[in-house]
């Protein structure tokens, strides 16, 4: 078979292959940060000569062009500067607003690297219509002035600008706009993974409302649907899996799917993942019919084995025929449901879309969109039983209109979107579900997000002081229960002068609590064993305290999980009648555990628990200390196997401010205590004033550091005694 | 509930490879919390500690059978493996499949197999 | 050095109280397991860590520890209680494991 010639450079930039230079090949264009390839790919022919899609004359001289953003076209009751006929990168747009007019949005705007304007679209109004102004974004014009209720805006886009989002709004009776704000976008622009992740989360999240099913949760404001224990999602997912994907590709469509499908099943919401590829024909890989479909495992499995040669006899995009199997499984459900039955009409239903291009066969996707928009029955009440993300992945042979005609057009949501390659939709997919954000008590969640605060990672962080100084840490464990160390009480302080310092979305400093009661556990004395050499004594280092107030859940509080508590089994997706030892073997599952515990600064930090025939080697050191214990006779009476060990090898150590916090671990994008700070050989903030300043121990040092943790699967009857009615334990 | 089941030949003749597997039920050779072991017991005599295996492939073998001992772990089937080279009579016991767990000072044998009595003759 | 001394024999008459001993270097670092095994089954757990009993197991059956000596203490014997008694401990590192030669109780 001929090849294609290999004269296909591109000045300032760079080219990648789909399959070598054999016909068939699609070979993509990128260039650096700043600047776009026209054209922007081309496809070997079975001739042996390239094309370049969409080209009406001979091949052109691929070059690497500035990449601009689009000026506004016009601006109501206002005026915008500098006036330019579009933006170069890192260029400003102001907005000013006439007397009488307030102005709405971002008053400076700047334009990015890849295209698009950051901040929100300015306008200016004066708060007369039923409906807010709906302003204008850049490179858009409007048709239609009165904002009334029943009252409709149209939108197009000057020149060859694309437009995303909704092309006509109604100004609905609850006084919001239908549908989604129009973005007229460059052809070759695309969009940035952080501001994908947010936009798809945050509907995401909206979608799933990922109740705790063990409480019912009031109705937020917006569109915050609860899937009760009753209720129920489908989950369709679709992979482009045509000739201009990449091998490689695939397998990053597939790993991003895997996320998405591991987040999925962290909410605690019963789910169903359909998985379909699909080329020139669908492949169903997994059917929402199937019962495996419910089954984390199951569904990994089949996606694992989704295989790329699959399709390698029609390469074609047949994006119609996929989203038409989806509508059959639907049918097929409803068949077997029943359609008037509330089983089928309460599940809600969300598609996602990953592809590389437009479809080139099979007819229209909006056709069988509309088949599914039908069969669900979707109409302004029932509107959020279905979302539709479509995903375009390589900015190349994206079709911005065909994909924006078929993502859902919700209000304050995006659900269509085009990044730059692979690895942003990867990056995407690590972000996308962060459910940090809900309201109930859900457990053991937080926001791993790269630009999340200290707090925001780990919520159920606090500070325990007493009037003067602080001293301690603890963790919430439920919304009016800190676990922490006994040894902070050792000195019978009255309670009463102690607050508990809980974290506040309001305020960087946190929000104070009292405490109405602490129960320390009656088997600490710290001088138990004095007699034996021991000078102190940490054995039951635990107490609880009772908050007055509830502590009302938020990004910045929330509760970690216990194991061995039906909580922290929904959030291990473990079966019905899992045990404690089940949640031990799970949770403390190998010679030296990777863990962490939060630092005076607020920050995560690293250590290994040191478990089985490894945790006698890192407690034995503890005898070679002989200013805490002068005349050991026996380690054994010291580190008990209450204790977990850690501050081996590159450990970090905790300070002694540090006592009483979690020790934890995350499994499935949820964080799990399995211990709390108790005492340790070393402390490496001693002499600093600084609480960022911590000081590693010398290698030399006799005896090594090591660090103690109460192990909570050792505490079991003293915690169900007094938790018994605030969590739900399961079985020892 | 764990239950442990050995299986192999009974009868072997001196020189030969004892090879014994442990099928285990009710529990996972791939959890990372448990030392699959294997222990004999001659007849009349005390128990004997041949070997333990975790999962993650590190063993431990009696110094005294060292050189001949083999214990190896097949997550797939959930079994675990004992190879023992060049018997003699001096091998002839009741073997028995065990799991092990360390827990903070002691480490103990909470689940047995049921034994398989190997007999060593020409 | 790697090795549990047990009484080969011991007896008790019914109800009354016995105590069965394992000595052993690696008793100073590591705390005795005991099994009971009954002829012709497979041994059983019966205590392990500093005094530590598996469910099912009667409370009878209790342990200690000093020095380098390991004691099973069961108070109250019962007839079923007749059976072999093995300690093992561990000894070095990792998994090396160590088992006594076995006591047998006999109930008068």
């Known amino acids: 078979a001929p090849s294609c010639p290999q004269n296909v450079n591109i000045s300032g930039g760079t080219f990648t292959l789909s399959h070598g230079w054999a016909p068939g090949s699609l070979l993509t264009y990128s260039c650096p940060q700043g600047l776009y390839p026209s054209p922007a790919s081309r496809l070997c022919k079975s001739s042996g000569q390239w094309q370049t899609p969409g080209a009406t004359r001979s091949l052109s001289k691929a070059v690497c062009k500035p990449v601009r953003c689009p000026a506004p076209v016009s601006f109501e009751n206002g005026i915008y500067t500098p006036r330019l006929g579009s933006y170069p990168v890192g260029g400003n747009v102001s907005f000013e607003c006439e007397d009488g007019f307030i102005l709405r949005g971002s008053p400076v705007r700047q334009c990015r690297p890849n295209g698009m304007w950051d901040g929100e679209t300015a306008v200016c109004d004066n708060g007369a219509g039923h409906c807010p102004n709906p302003g204008i974004s850049l490179g858009a014009v409007r048709t239609g002035f009165r904002f009334g209720h029943g009252d409709k805006v149209r939108y197009r886009c000057s020149s060859n600008l694309v437009l995303t989002g909704s092309s006509e709004r109604e100004c609905q009776g609850n006084g919001v706009w239908s549908g989604t704000e129009p973005i007229c976008r460059q052809p070759y622009s695309y969009d940035f993974p952080e501001d994908v992740a947010p936009a798809l989360g945050t509907s995401f999240s909206h979608m799933l409302g990922a109740t705790n099913p063990t409480q019912k949760t009031k109705e937020s404001l917006g569109r915050k649907i609860q899937i009760q224990r009753s209720g129920h999602l489908n989950l369709y997912l679709l992979l482009d899996c045509s000739q201009s994907v990449s091998e490689n590709d695939f397998l990053i469509f597939k790993e991003s799917a895997s996320l998405m499908v591991d987040r999925i099943f962290s909410f605690e919401i019963n789910v169903s993942v359909a998985i379909i590829t699909f080329a020139s024909e669908p492949k169903v890989l997994m059917s929402v019919l199937n019962d495996n479909s419910r089954d984390m495992t199951e569904v990994i499995s089949s996606l694992e084995n989704a295989n790329y040669k699959d399709h390698e006899n029609g390469t074609g995009t047949n994006t119609y025929a996929a989203l038409n199997s989806v509508y059959l499984m639907m049918n097929n459900q409803m068949r077997l449901l029943g359609m008037e039955t509330m089983a089928w009409q309460e599940i809600r239903h969300a598609i996602i879309l990953l592809t590389d291009g437009k479809s080139n066969m099979g007819g229209s996707p909006k056709t069988a969109v509309d088949h599914i928009r039908e069969i669900l029955n979707i109409n302004q009440k029932r509107n959020d039983y279905l979302d539709i993300y479509a995903i375009g992945v390589g900015k190349l042979d994206v079709d911005w209109r065909e994909l924006n005609e078929l993502g859902s057009k919700k209000d304050g949501e995006r659900h269509a979107f085009i990044l730059q390659d692979t690895k942003a939709l990867h990056q995407v997919f690590e972000h996308m579900l962060d459910v940090s954000k809900l309201t109930d008590t859900i457990c053991g969640v937080g926001n791993m997000s790269a630009n999340a605060s200290d707090q925001e990672r780990t919520p159920w962080h606090v500070t325990i002081k007493p009037k003067s100084q602080e001293t301690c840490r603890g963790a919430l464990i439920s919304d009016q229960w800190v676990l922490t160390a006994a040894h902070c009480f050792r000195d019978g302080n009255d309670h009463s002068l102690w607050r508990v310092n809980v974290g506040d979305p309001k305020s960087q400093w946190g929000k104070e609590f009292l405490i109405e009661k602490a129960v320390i556990s009656p088997g600490f004395d710290v001088f138990a064993k004095k007699n034996q050499g021991i000078l102190e004594f940490y054995g039951d280092d635990i107490a609880l305290l009772k908050l007055a107030q509830k502590v009302k859940m938020s990004t910045h509080a929330r509760p970690i999980c216990l194991p061995c508590t039906m909580e922290a089994n929904l959030a291990l997706r473990r079966p019905q009648g899992s045990t404690c030892r089940d949640h031990e073997n799970e949770l403390l599952n190998k010679q030296s555990v990777p863990a962490h515990f939060v630092a005076l600064n607020g920050s995560k930090l690293n250590i290994n628990l040191k478990m089985g025939v490894e945790w006698t080697s890192c407690a034995e050191v503890v005898s070679q200390e002989k200013t805490m214990f002068p005349n050991l006779t026996d380690v054994r009476e010291v580190v008990t196997d209450q204790f977990l060990c850690s501050g081996t090898q590159e450990d970090e150590s905790p300070c002694k401010g540090e006592s009483g916090g979690a020790v934890f671990l995350e499994r499935r994008f949820r964080f799990f205590q399995v211990g709390l700070v108790s005492w340790g050989l070393y402390n490496p903030c001693l002499g600093s004033a600084d609480k960022n300043s911590r000081k590693r121990a010398p290698r030399s040092k006799v005896p090594p550091p090591r660090d103690f943790h109460i192990n909570l699967f050792r505490m079991q009857p003293w915690l169900r005694q007094h938790l018994g009615d605030v969590l739900n334990f399961l079985p020892l | 509930q764990v239950q442990l089941r050995e299986s192999g030949p009974g009868l072997m003749k001196p020189s030969e490879t004892l090879s014994l597997t442990c099928t285990v039920s009710g529990g996972s050779v791939s959890s990372g919390v448990y030392y699959w072991t294997w222990i004999r017991q001659p007849p009349g005599k005390g128990l004997e500690w041949i070997g333990s295996m975790f999962y993650s492939g590190n063993a431990d073998y009696n110094p005294s059978l060292k050189s001949r001992v083999t214990i190896s772990v097949d997550t797939s089937k959930n079994q675990f493996s004992l190879r023992l080279n060049s018997v003699s009579a001096a091998d002839m016991a009741v073997y028995y499949c065990?799991?092990?767990?360390?827990?903070?000072?002691?480490?103990?044998?909470?689940?047995w197999g049921q034994a398989t009595l190997v007999t060593v003759s020409s | 050095s790697s090795e549990l001394t047990q009484d080969p024999t011991v007896s008790v008459a019914l109800g009354q109280t016995v105590r069965i001993t394992c000595q052993g270097d690696?008793?100073?670092?590591?705390?005795a397991s005991w099994y009971q095994q009954k002829p012709g089954q497979a041994p059983v757990l019966v205590l392990y860590g500093k005094n530590n009993r598996p469910s099912g197991i009667p409370d009878r059956f209790s342990g200690s520890s000093s020095g380098n000596t390991a004691s099973l203490t069961i108070t109250g014997a019962q007839a079923e209680d007749e059976a072999d008694y093995y300690c093992?401990?561990?000894?070095?590192?990792?998994?090396?494991?160590?088992f006594g030669g076995g006591t047998k109780l006999t109930v008068l």
């Open positions: 065990a799991r092990g767990y360390a827990s903070g000072w002691s480490y103990y044998f909470d689940y």
């Open positions: 093992n401990s561990r000894y070095s590192s990792g998994t090396h494991v160590v």
């Open positions: 690696s008793l100073r670092t590591y705390y």
